[in-house]
Interface confidence: medium
């Protein structure tokens, strides 16, 4: 039978009355236009909603916007447009919300053509009050907060100037001209690229990479011949043009650009690109585009210095620079990533890794599903997940895969079951063990969200018709109840819940359409009375993550350690609560070959844990660049996976000798760098 229709599905008692008492409608006194919503702070209940409406006049477009504020998670809203002097706010800049619980908000206003600079509205009290500030420049980008100090802001101007404020946007100073891209690093450091000749586009590949650690008092040039740069985890990456041709290579620094090493990655040509798919303080996943317009490339995983890379996955789907990739970090279980590969016949297949890119496999076929006609063998097939690429292709996929760090093991995604992703209408699948096993959760496409750290899952059917029904599950998607939240169906536009999945409130956004007008409307439903009591010790059960063979002593060992979690029993209908903290018990494992990646010049044949020498490098000295010097690598083919905590057991030897020779191809050696002060 279909999910939710099994005999063992118990009804949640009196849920209709409980939810009806906790359903709050707000009709916005607005023409439809567009709406954007931002949460201000964590657990504050403060939501800002900006509605904008463009009226195209004969000569120009006239715009109006309204600002609304809620301080009860969206149950009630107050029109606070007068706090911003009824000014039209530019939606392309969004609402710049400060980090952590700073309570800071910056809105960028539309100004008339002849004005000297832009205008912002600033709040530092969770949008209770705003201060209008006229800028000495026209902003090109949204204001960017320093992650360490929310009083420090940076912005680029339409004239390519880099502007910095040290007092939360009250006063601004242009610290550099001719800037293409600027980013905050750690410790209030700013990294930026500059052009010397014409423009950012004209100088691509001839840009300079600069750093300031004192908000513009002094500068250091840390790279030349730069194409682009990026920050990921503790790594700073730059793609640098080669001296002789139009190829470029990745260089990496772990000391804010003082010293650089050339990454052992293939160089790329003009039409190719590099992309940092994911990075943490241990390692980085790097995509290197294949030559030609293939739409795929190779994923490499780095060592702990970001220098030596192992091939992780071939034919990785990634359409173009800034294009679409399905690469997804499953945040509900460590080490798990999902992505798509492009097979030889040009169909798309989903792959999953449970060990941070060490090995990739297909997703196991859900128990309650049959293979579709993409399958050559109807008894053997896999689950294939729809993500960004499917959404970009306008397939019937309303949402990307969803996982939350505090909803341990839960992954929800649209998918199809066969030999490849299908263009047929997808269903929604759930995994409760981080992607090892899957079950069909809902028939057809849905919007979905996780509340109360996984205690409740909420879903709304994706339909072109107006809707008035919401579905919810208190047992991780096994059984579903439906609740009619309004008599008058609305055209649904989105589900909104507080980031972090700790809330028990969900807002359903949409619009009503009548003969003469259409209006924005939101329904906020609080599930607190469905989960009547707080969870107790008896409501939780011990779960060993990554467990595939309970008989094996090393069962659950991933990246050198195993973790036991306390997880809510599916049968328990209770509140985890806003203060819920994931309880986990780690234990260290003995080292095995699985804890080592293949070193530079080595690879793992399929279904083998041993690393063997790449045939083309057999008998050659393995040399690579480190901090501008050439190194000689003596290895038996293994290196510890970054972040792996195993101890004892297998311990392959690895040694690096300094060859005391300069690397001719390292364009970022220290002597090419210089400093200057303002």
């Amino acid at each position: 039978s279909a999910p939710g229709e099994d005999e063992e599905c118990g009804r949640v008692r009196d849920f209709v009355a409980k939810l009806a008492n906790n359903t709050h409608q707000h009709v916005f006194d607005d023409l439809r236009g567009s709406v954007s919503l931002s949460w201000v702070g964590d657990s504050t209940g403060v939501i800002l909603v900006l509605t904008t409406f463009h009226v195209p006049l004969v000569i120009m477009t006239f715009g109006q916007s309204k600002l609304y504020r809620s301080e009860d998670y969206g149950k009630n809203f107050k029109d606070i447009t007068d706090l911003i002097n009824n000014t039209f706010i530019r939606t392309e800049f969004g609402m710049a919300i400060g980090p952590e619980n700073s309570g800071k908000v910056v809105l960028t206003a539309e100004v008339s053509g002849g004005s000297r600079g832009g205008r912002i509205f600033r709040s530092s009290d969770f949008a209770k009050n705003f201060v209008q500030t006229d800028l000495p420049f026209h902003p090109l980008t949204q204001m960017m907060y320093s992650p360490q100090n929310s009083d420090y802001l940076l912005a680029l101007s339409t004239e390519n100037g880099l502007w910095v404020s040290k007092n939360f946007g009250g006063k601004w100073e242009e610290i550099h001209k001719a800037v293409c891209l600027a980013k905050w690093g750690s410790d209030n450091t700013i990294f930026f690229t500059t052009y010397a000749n014409g423009s950012c586009k004209a100088d691509l590949g001839a840009l300079e990479l600069w750093r300031t650690s004192d908000l513009g008092k002094s500068f250091k040039t840390i790279g030349v011949k730069i194409y682009s740069f990026g920050l990921g985890g503790r790594f700073l990456f730059a793609s640098v043009m080669a001296d002789k041709d139009t190829t470029r290579r990745i260089h990496v620094s772990t000391d804010q650009g003082d010293t650089w090493s050339m990454a052992q990655l293939p160089s790329v040509g003009q039409e190719q690109f590099y992309s940092i798919l994911a990075a943490n303080d241990d390692m980085v996943f790097m995509h290197v585009d294949e030559p030609g317009d293939t739409g795929f490339g190779t994923i490499f995983t780095s060592d702990d210095r970001g220098i030596v890379y192992s091939k992780s996955l071939d034919r990785h789907l990634y359409t173009t620079t800034g294009g679409e990739t399905d690469f997804t970090n499953v945040t509900s279980l460590r080490g798990v990533y999902i992505t798509s590969v492009l097979s030889e016949d040009n169909s798309i297949q989903t792959m999953i890794t449970f060990d941070q890119g060490g090995r990739w496999t297909h997703l196991r076929k859900p128990e309650n599903s049959e293979c579709d006609a993409t399958a050559k063998n109807k008894n053997e097939c896999s689950l294939h997940i729809h993500a960004s690429y499917s959404i970009s292709q306008k397939l019937n996929v309303p949402m990307a895969p969803l996982s939350e760090p505090n909803a341990v093991g839960i992954v929800i995604a649209h998918g199809s079951v066969g030999d490849a992703i299908s263009v047929m209408v997808p269903d929604v699948y759930i995994s409760d063990d981080g992607g090892y096993s899957w079950t069909k959760m809902l028939e057809g496409p849905h919007y979905y969200t996780i509340l109360d750290s996984g205690g409740i899952i909420v879903a709304i059917e994706h339909s072109s018709r107006p809707i008035n029904v919401i579905k919810f599950s208190t047992d991780e998607g096994q059984c579903w109840q439906t609740y009619t939240f309004t008599r008058d169906p609305i055209y649904f536009t989105g589900l909104a819940s507080e980031p972090g999945a700790r809330s028990m409130n969900i807002s359903i956004w949409g619009f009503t359409e009548s003969f003469l007008t259409s209006q924005w409307v939101s329904y906020t439903i609080d599930f607190k009375d469905i989960l009547e009591r707080n969870c107790e010790e008896k409501d939780y059960t011990i779960w060993l993550a990554h467990s595939t063979d309970p008989e094996d002593y090393e069962d659950g060992c991933i990246l050198g350690y195993k973790e036991q979690f306390l997880r809510l029993r599916k049968s328990s209908v209770c509140q985890n609560g806003r203060d819920y903290v994931v309880t986990k018990q780690p234990s260290i494992c003995l080292c095995s070959l699985e804890d080592f990646l293949c070193d530079f010049g080595y690879y793992r044949p399929e279904n083998d844990s041993k690393c063997v020498e790449q045939p083309e490098l057999k008998g050659h000295d393995l040399e690579f660049c480190l901090y501008g010097r050439e190194e000689h690598l003596t290895t038996n083919g293994y290196r510890k996976i970054p972040g792996d905590k195993c101890q004892g057991g297998v311990n392959p030897v690895r040694e690096v000798k300094d060859l005391k020779k300069k690397c001719t191809s390292n364009f970022l050696s220290p002597e090419k760098q210089n400093s200057k002060s303002n």
Epitope: C371, D372, A373, T374, K378, G418, I421, V423
Partner: antibody, heavy 129, light 107 residues
Framework: QVQLVQSGAEVKKPGASVKVSCKAS????????MSWVRQAPGQGLEWMGI????????SYAQKFQGRVTMTRDTSTSTAYMELSSLRSEDTAVYYC??????????????????????WGQGTTVTVSS | EIVMTQSPATLSVSPGERATLSCRAS??????LAWYQQKPGQAPRLLIY???TRATGIPARFSGSGSGTEFTLTISSLQSEDFAVYYC?????????FGGGTKVEIK
């Protein structure tokens, strides 16, 4: 040889339902999708939907959503198309057609589409009071 | 849905002459396009798939070209049995859609 044989002509009253069958032979029924296409008198071709013969999952054109039901019986290698709440504008010839591409989503170079390579002879459905 | 537009609606050609039929998509369909021939009282017959590949048993005088939004079916030298209605069909995104058809008649 590979062929699709459809059921005979039908005359129905408005509001009634019609169920057209399409029996496949000469190939493995479960390896190919089946599309249904109709053609009103003097008009062009109109795609109604597609059925996956293994799982039985379907995808219908929006226009027919709620009125059309496509099913299959793998034991007899037969696909069925039922259209309910008939109106006079449903008078048409209804075709089943083998759709071998499966429905694998495309990579950046586009999905390779093989076309509907085998067609039934057509079933004439007349809706008249 | 993707709208397919065929032109001309009718094409009058003498036997032995070349016929060029056009099909335009409202958005890119890549190469996911097929051409069909239909004669009165008969089911359609697949001529071209993948925008340019001839189906089994289709004579070499039929050729297809194009990708993205513009497609062409060319019949290099019309034979008497080629006078029929020709349809293009996209299968890039559901629902599959057909063009309105081009009738090739004897001049």
């Amino acid at each position: 040889q590979v062929q699709l044989v459809q059921s005979g002509a039908e005359v129905k009253k408005p509001g009634a339902s019609v169920k057209v069958s399409c029996k496949a032979s000469g190939y493995t029924f479960t390896k190919y999708y089946m599309s249904w296409v109709r053609q009103a008198p003097g008009q062009g071709l109109e795609w109604m939907g597609i059925i996956n013969p293994i799982g039985g999952s379907t995808s219908y054109a929006q226009k027919f959503q709620g009125r059309v039901t496509m099913t299959r019986d793998t034991s007899t290698s037969t696909a069925y198309m039922e259209l309910s709440s008939l109106r006079s504008e449903d008078t048409a010839v209804y075709y089943c057609a083998r759709d071998p591409s499966g429905i694998a989503a495309a990579g950046p170079a586009g999905r390779y589409y093989y076309g509907m390579d085998v067609w039934g002879q057509g079933t004439t459905v007349t809706v008249s009071s | 849905e993707i709208v397919m537009t065929q032109s001309p609606a009718t094409l009058s050609v003498s036997p032995g002459e070349r016929a060029t039929l056009s099909c335009r998509a409202s958005q890119s369909v890549s190469s996911n396009l097929a051409w069909y021939q239909q004669k009165p009282g008969q089911a359609p017959r697949l001529l071209i798939y993948g925008a340019s590949t001839r189906a089994t048993g289709i004579p070499a005088r039929f050729s297809g070209s194009g990708s993205g939004t513009e497609f062409t079916l060319t019949i290099s030298s019309l034979q008497s049995e080629d006078f029929a209605v020709y349809y293009c069909q996209q299968a890039r995104l559901g629902p599959w859609t057909f063009g309105g058809g081009t009738k090739v008649e004897i001049k």
